[in-house]
């Protein structure tokens, strides 16, 4: 004979089972019987904590009975068969189904054996992320918005960016009872440097295998930021023609470039070609301050550049010369 205490009948079940709102879920529950042990199961019982009576009973002679017959079903228990599997299927999961359930086997001669299972009712949220298009304000404003709709429990939203920024997260009840919609705003002082950069919204939820990452491309509307390039302070009489470029960053894109001088219109040697200004060869020294004025939908900004064409040997220098 095996020594006493070598084994006992044990009820095996997961401590927690997830199920989705509106779906069906199986609460697994099995009786584990050691090899040499004799046991007889006369009844399987499911009860919910805090409620009197049983929600489901399978009796060896009478078969199953349910508190809600349309929503509950023993998966494997059959009349005339050994009762070792008490797994119970629940249909049409509701928020109020979440809670602790006890699965109990009435075994002879070992007595009643039970285990508790926590049923988690989940709802998988839908996630969206969108840019909040902003202008230069000088103070922090929402620049991106991430929404996780109809989750249970509420989703966790975090932001990932090299730009700094602060999250502002809020919750409201979802469309379905017991669900939650989480909205997170990413807040920063807008600047032209931020325009076109990316921030990532990370949404975590029990129902996801891995976090969902949503990328937002930031938009900051700002008037043109203007500079003039192409002049190196070494322009001399007799050198080839040169080009100055009016460099403008703006959002939206520039709608117009206007070249002038502090004295008024452009002199004959300067020819405007959109963002570029062609400087033709000259035969006498020049000292002129050029202005590039750039316009976009938000306004106009300008940059000035003083250009000098000096006397000197053209062979050693770049710049303007006759052919």
């Amino acid at each position: 004979w095996p020594p006493p205490g070598t084994g006992d009948v044990v009820v095996q079940a997961p401590t927690q089972v997830p199920g989705f709102l509106g779906d069906s879920v199986t609460l697994p529950c099995y009786l584990q019987v050691p090899n040499m042990e004799v046991t007889h199961v006369s009844q399987l019982t499911w009860a919910r904590h805090g409620e009197s009576g049983s929600m489901a009973v399978f009796h060896q002679t009478q078969g199953p009975s349910y508190s809600e017959s349309k929503r509950l079903e023993f998966v494997a228990a059959r009349l005339g068969a050994e009762l070792r599997n008490a797994s119970l299927r629940m249909f049409g999961l509701r928020v109020e189904d979440e809670g602790n359930y006890t699965c109990l086997f009435v075994t002879f001669p070992q007595g009643s054996r039970s285990v508790d299972i926590w049923l988690r009712v989940l709802a998988k949220p839908q996630n969206t992320a969108e840019v909040q298009k902003v202008q230069l304000t000088g103070e922090p404003v929402p620049m991106a918005r991430c929404v996780s709709t109809g989750g249970r429990p509420p989703a966790q939203i975090t932001w990932h960016s090299d730009l700094g920024g602060m999250p502002n997260t809020s919750q409201v009840p979802g469309f379905l009872s017991g669900t939650v919609t989480v909205t997170s705003l990413w807040i920063l002082v807008p600047s032209s440097q931020v325009d076109g950069k990316n921030v990532t919204c990370k949404v975590e939820h029990e129902s996801f295998e891995k976090p969902q990452l949503l990328t937002v491309n930031l938009t900051v509307y700002y008037p043109p930021e203007v500079s003039i390039s192409g002049y190196d302070n070494n322009w001399y009489l007799g050198q080839n023609e040169a080009t100055l470029t009016c460099d403008a960053r703006s959002n939206p894109e520039p709608t117009g470039y206007n070249w002038s001088t502090t004295m008024g219109p452009l002199p004959p040697f300067a020819v405007a070609q959109g963002a570029q200004l062609l400087i033709r060869p000259v035969d006498k020294p020049i000292n002129t301050t050029l202005i590039c004025n750039v316009t976009n939908a938000l306004g106009a900004r300008q940059a000035e550049l003083t250009v000098q064409v000096k006397e000197g040997p053209p062979s050693e220098h770049s710049g303007i010369s006759r052919n």
């Epitope: 006493p4 205490g5 070598t6 006992d8 004799v38 006369s42 060896q60 001669p109 070992q110 007595g111």
Partner: antibody, heavy 121, light 109 residues
């Protein structure tokens, strides 16, 4: 109250069979487990088998396998134990006992008064 | 074949405490042995006292308590009464069968 009433004493010849009855009252018979136990003169108690009245499922002490049969009649709430190929050392008082639940545990709750079976040539 | 051993006899004074033990030949008694205790008074039917090591049956006086004591099952009677004078049997479960102890004759005097 719960009662188990057993049939009267039996005298049998070696090789014969005996069938002892145990009539239950005061509880739901079909949901019960009943054990049979015997006590030979000057000897200790010996467990023979148990039966689940609702289905007739049984578990026998291997010592008696093949010689003993336990049955129930749910219409009369009666359990039976038949012992075949009787030998003189089967002479004993035979008891039926109903197992009851105390909390989550079974115990030998209520016993019949015993049936004396004498095997003698 | 498992053998269950009890003290053949014990004596207790009225109001006193006595512990009856139940040893298994196969090793320590555990909860898996589902120790049961039954009582038989002279001229009366057996009566169940304890199931599952330490669970008193309905109507069984609180002075009876079951436990595991070291490697044995035990029945403790606290505040013995004259009517507790009886034969006490321990029953152990061994995976597929019950085995009875030889019984303890308890005298209250």
């Amino acid at each position: 109250q719960v009662q188990l009433v057993q049939s009267g004493a039996e005298v049998k010849k070696p090789g014969a069979s005996v069938k002892v009855s145990c009539k239950a009252s005061g509880y739901t018979f079909t949901s019960s487990y009943i054990s049979w136990v015997r006590q030979a003169p000057g000897q200790g108690l010996e467990w023979i088998a148990w039966i689940y009245a609702g289905t007739g499922d049984t578990n026998y002490n291997q010592k008696f396998t093949g010689r003993v049969t336990m049955t129930t009649d749910t219409s009369t709430s009666t359990a039976y134990m038949e012992l075949r190929s009787l030998r003189s050392d089967d002479t004993a008082v035979y008891y039926c006992a109903r197992h009851g639940l105390t909390g989550r545990h079974w115990y030998f709750a209520v016993w019949g008064q015993g049936t004396t079976v004498t095997v003698s040539s | 074949q498992a053998v269950v051993t009890q003290e053949p006899s014990l004596t207790v004074s009225p109001g006193g405490t006595v512990t009856l033990t139940c040893r298994s030949s196969t090793g320590a008694v555990t909860t898996s042995n589902i120790a049961n205790w039954v009582q038989q008074k002279p001229g009366q039917a057996f009566r169940g006292l304890i199931g599952g090591t330490n669970n008193r049956g309905p109507g069984v006086p609180a002075r009876f308590s079951g436990s595991l004591l070291g490697d044995k099952a035990a029945l403790t009677l606290s505040g013995a009464q004259p009517e507790d004078e009886a034969e006490y049997y321990c029953i152990l479960w061994y995976s597929n069968k019950f085995v009875f102890g030889g019984g303890t004759k308890l005298t209250v005097l």
